[in-house]
């Protein structure tokens, strides 16, 4: 988990001839605000919803009135950063759209009017935790200067925010291959539970046993660079998964949508469908009228002149939702059978089949066990002529449909403390014990009969890759 941060430095006329007229005038003072939309992957088609990584709206900037006869200067900007929280791993590559909007504050009927001044878009590679990246984009005669970065929210660390930091009980000792967590030097990286050998630079996992590649890398361990041409293929981060897929908490757990919004999971995060009068990533923005310009993607706002009366967005073709915020989802017809994942690539629908199924719509059953549905990433195990589900971490019951506390089984031995994280279980060992489950007492050499390590000796920590 983490936050993408965007800092707008300036918005104004670009260099060269043909400077644009100021968007504001003495008769029509105005102010600016910005909207950012993030999508995973290098390709436009990689996003399976308009802003799959998230979107954010800035505050309004100061009111600006053009001075007669003066050239259009850089326009006054809103304070603060635009922040787009992401729940899962940072994908490493992303596409962005930054829109500059003008809010006119004249005496026109119906209150302020909104209009889109400029839209810039781009595709970038970015590692989480790195320094601010500076950028300049031009849209027509306008120029936008900005910086951006992705940072992880504790306890996550790493270039994809998939590593976990946790306190250690003695200085300078972490586990096999585990470095101190810069800048938290008093903490250690806790183990990733990725597939063994998964590249720490180019791979990541959101579930134990998998190895998902950042854009530009491929192979089962994400060690093979993809050629430039295939980097732009219509794919998001690839998945080379083996073993037991273990989902962490669902993105809709606890319903992140405020004000009666309903939550639906997307391939990388979640999406809120907001009731009338509310919008925003989590339906947190309220008291909306047409003056607030709540209709995205070119939707036409009708009614709602005051906060007590509802507005209606008339959406252009291809968009839907109370704020035209959602691309029409052809996957809602559920064309993929047997639990296949539907991908709307724009030009075509594609089904990504579960293990054991094949065919354009996953209609072909490849193995006997696949007829037995194990929910939530559970795997079907054949044994003794019967089938049963081996449930993923955090799930239980006959078909793995029941939520279970992964720490309830008390996996940590010898007083180790259990933490359930989206990347798997982590045991923090008591002094004198080592192993991923703290199952081994530490014996200094030549004293193997001792039950524990002497004071100050830090036990080993779990391996980095499980």
């Amino acid at each position: 988990a983490g936050v993408f941060e965007l800092q707008i430095h300036s918005f104004g006329p670009g260099p060269g001839p043909g400077a644009p007229r100021s968007p504001c005038s003495a008769r029509l003072p105005c102010r600016l605000f910005f909207r950012v939309c993030l999508k995973p992957g290098l390709s436009e088609e990689a996003a399976e919803s308009p802003c799959a990584l998230g979107a954010a709206l800035s505050a309004r900037g100061p009111v600006y009135t053009e001075q007669p006869g003066a050239p259009a200067p850089d326009l006054p900007l809103p304070d603060g950063l635009l922040q787009v929280p992401f729940r899962d791993a940072w994908p490493g590559t992303f596409s962005f759209i930054i829109e500059t909007w003008r809010e006119e504050l004249g005496d026109q009927i119906g209150g302020p009017a909104w209009s889109l001044l400029a839209r810039v878009a781009g595709r970038r590679r970015l590692a989480a935790g790195g320094p601010w990246a500076r950028d300049i984009q031009r849209a027509g005669a306008w120029e936008l200067r900005f910086s951006y970065r992705a940072r992880c929210e504790p306890p996550a660390v790493g270039t994809a925010c998939t590593r976990l930091c946790r306190p250690r009980s003695a200085p300078s000792r972490c586990g096999p291959g585990l470095r101190p967590c810069a800048p938290l030097e008093d903490e250690c990286e806790a183990p990733l539970v990725c597939r063994a050998g998964c590249s720490p630079e180019h791979g990541f996992c959101e579930q134990p046993g998998e190895c998902r590649c950042l854009e530009g890398w491929t192979g089962p361990l994400c060690t093979v660079p993809v050629s430039t041409s295939s980097c732009l293929s219509p794919r998001g981060p690839s998945s080379a998964t083996t073993g037991c897929l273990v989902p962490g908490p669902g993105p809709c757990d606890g319903n992140p949508c405020a004000n009666g919004g309903s939550c639906s999971e997307t391939p990388r995060s979640f999406e809120c469908t907001c009731p009338r009068g509310f919008y925003g990533l989590r339906c947190e923005v309220s008291g909306v009228t047409c003056a607030d310009g709540p209709c995205f993607n070119g939707g036409l706002c009708v009614g709602g002149a005051d906060p007590d009366s509802a507005y209606i967005c008339h959406c252009p073709p291809g968009f839907q939702g109370s704020n035209c915020e959602k691309r029409v989802d052809r996957c809602s017809l559920q064309p993929c059978r047997n639990g296949g994942l539907c991908l709307d690539l724009g030009h075509a629908l594609r089904c990504r089949c579960r293990a054991g199924f094949a065919g354009p719509r996953c209609e072909h059953d490849l193995d006997d066990c696949a007829g037995r549905a194990c929910a939530n990433g559970g795997t079907c195990v054949e044994g003794g002529g019967a089938h049963r589900c081996s449930c993923a971490l955090g799930f239980g019951g006959r078909d793995c449909r029941e939520r279970a506390d992964p720490c309830a089984a008390r996996p940590c031995a010898h007083g180790g403390r259990c933490y359930a994280h989206f990347s798997g279980l982590v045991c923090a060992c008591a002094p004198g014990y080592m192993g991923a489950r703290c199952e081994f007492p530490v014996h200094p050499d030549g004293a193997s009969a001792l039950p524990a390590a002497p004071p100050g000796l830090r036990p080993g920590d779990p391996q980095r890759y499980l």
Partner: antibody, heavy 122, light 106 residues
Framework: EVRLVQSGAEVKKPGASVKVSCKAS????????MNWVRQAPGQSLEWMGI????????SYNQKFRGRVTLTVDKSASTAYMELSSLRSEDTAVYYC???????????????WGQGTTVTVSS | DIQMTQSPSSLSASVGDRVTITCKAS?????VSWYQQKPGKAPKLLIY???NRYTGVPSRFSGSGSGTDFTLTISSLQPEDFATYYC?????????FGQGTKLEIK
Amino acid sequence: EVRLVQSGAEVKKPGASVKVSCKASGYTFTDYYMNWVRQAPGQSLEWMGIINPYTGDTSYNQKFRGRVTLTVDKSASTAYMELSSLRSEDTAVYYCARYHYGPHLEGYFDVWGQGTTVTVSS
Amino acid sequence: DIQMTQSPSSLSASVGDRVTITCKASENVGYVSWYQQKPGKAPKLLIYGASNRYTGVPSRFSGSGSGTDFTLTISSLQPEDFATYYCGQSYSYPLTFGQGTKLEIK
């Protein structure tokens, strides 16, 4: 390819010590614990101990009462097992075995060395 | 220490037979792993976490059980399956193995 290659057979006299090496390749040596397991002729497997190659921390089977010492040379990606005060019942094949964890933190030995035969005879 | 008891100690079977080997722990071990060993060779991992087949292990091998009672099943014996099989527990220190089950050709 992940491989563990052990040193050759040894013949020792009672009371002596033996040091067996295990060179790892194909993976990052410090990312996985290393175990030593022995097998006397016609017998089952017997766990001797485990070492954290990153820190050097060790845990031993109490049965060996301080006779076993596990060490590593990180720069050479090599683990060592030294057994002292040898007696005839220490005659066995000694294996190094990499320790791996599954998603529920279930440990298992996923890669084994080819084994080193140690014969203790007067 | 936790005792792991395998049964039977030895077993004669034919190619194509279905074979079941059991492993009983003296106390709860949560899960076991199963290993195959051929004469003069190192053991090879077959099953971990009681029921997870290791990479490259044929689907005719399956494991089941939890707590103290575990089973390894070979659904249809192949000539290369004749070997000695060991269960092992890594749940509790010290790690221990069963005494082995020798699978011979009938």
